[in-house]
């Protein structure tokens, strides 16, 4: 058995921030689970992790430098990404692992969400820009 995941096909991050909702065919209430968001066609970059535990507050973290937060619904996890760069426009995949109680369950690979970062460029602009190059 595999959990099915639904994601929006595309989201636009206008102000370098976006909410990506991962909807699961599984109720996460009272389960211990690890939901994560991965960047790239090969899902090589783990952008953000939400760890849910029946007895503790939700743990949200990124080991790859992304500014992220997470919110839990009964059958969903929403990732809130901030301070995105234009060059982080890419496809992002939701992943879920339900660890406890057994049996272990994970998801069928979803279709992913293309996040198009259109916001302000977050690189610092010089105070006195030099002559533009052709």
């Amino acid at each position: 058995n595999k959990i099915l995941v639904k994601q929006s096909p595309m989201l636009v991050a206008y102000d370098n921030a976006v909410n990506l909702s991962c909807k699961y065919s599984y109720n996460l209430f009272s389960r211990e689970f690890r939901a994560s968001l991965h960047k790239g066609l090969d899902s090589a970059v783990e952008v953000c992790v939400v760890y849910g535990n029946y007895s503790q507050q939700l743990q949200v973290y990124s080991k790859t430098g992304f500014n992220c937060d997470g919110k839990l619904g009964n059958e969903s996890v929403t990732f809130y990404l901030q301070n995105l760069y234009v060059n982080q426009t890419d496809i992002y995949f939701c992943k879920i692992e339900v660890m406890y109680p057994p049996p272990y369950l994970d998801n069928e690979k979803s279709n992913g969400t293309i996040i198009h970062v259109k916001g302000k460029h977050l690189c610092p602009s010089p105070l006195f820009p030099g002559p533009s190059k052709p």
Partner: antibody
């Protein structure tokens, strides 16, 4: 038949680190089961240390979380346990085991003894 | 954490005796009709061996004199007719919640 063989035990100084290996045969550790480490202090009961899932995700006992790392090398079909800042109470036989569908531990290694002493 | 309390901690019995060991969990370990409670046998200097999983299912290769029962918080391991090779320490273990926890063990000795 699944076989698990631990190695790397021995005498370690307090404050030191240990890295134990668990070589698996008869089953590929990346193929779908989960794998755990358990320890048993001399004359005492069993204590769960942590586990690694076939996805590579790990989970550690809260009491050891800050000192322990479980990893694997799929090419060598081997699991590893790293434990840092060792103290006398870490003296134990360390076992690796496979978790079945219900997370019962259906295959165990023979264990390796770690003694923490100066 | 879920605490598992075994009783008795030790017992003396003779070959042929019926032996019962109980394991009480500090909270239910049931989920959708399954009990995530397992039993192991350990002999001195050896690794534990799985006897019963999911409260009552006999692990492959384990003699039928071993049986398990119970649900919720109260579980029992029964050896219907004790054999010489059954003198060992028995542990229960829950896998309903992390951290996985074990009972303190019950040592079965020869009377």
């Amino acid at each position: 038949e699944v076989q698990l063989v631990e190695s790397g035990g021995g005498l370690v100084q307090p404050g030191g680190s240990l890295r134990l290996s668990c070589a698996a045969s008869g089953y590929s550790i990346s193929s779908g089961y989960h794998w755990g480490w358990i320890r048993q202090a001399p004359g005492k009961g069993l204590e769960w240390i942590g586990e690694i899932y076939h996805s590579g995700s790990t989970y550690y006992s809260p009491s050891l979380k800050s000192r322990v790392t479980i990893s694997r090398d799929n090419s060598k079909n081997t699991l590893y346990l790293q434990l840092n800042s060792l103290r006398a109470e870490d003296t134990a036989v360390y076992y690796c085991a496979r978790k079945d569908y219900y997370y019962a531990l259906d295959y165990w290694g023979q264990g390796t003894l770690v003694t923490v002493s100066s | 954490d879920i605490q598992l309390t075994q009783s008795p901690s030790s017992l003396s019995a003779s070959v042929g005796d019926r032996v019962t060991i109980t394991c009480r969990a500090s909270q239910s370990v049931d989920f959708y009709g399954k009990s995530f409670l397992h039993w192991y046998q350990q002999k001195p200097g050896k690794a534990p061996k799985l006897l019963i999983y999911a409260a009552s299912t006999l692990q492959s290769g384990v003699p039928s004199r071993f049986s398990g029962s119970g649900s919720g918080t109260d579980f029992t391991l029964t050896i219907s007719s004790l054999q010489p090779e059954d003198f060992a320490t028995y542990y229960c273990q829950q896998s309903y919640r992390t951290p996985l926890t074990f009972g303190q063990g019950t040592k079965v000795e020869i009377k």
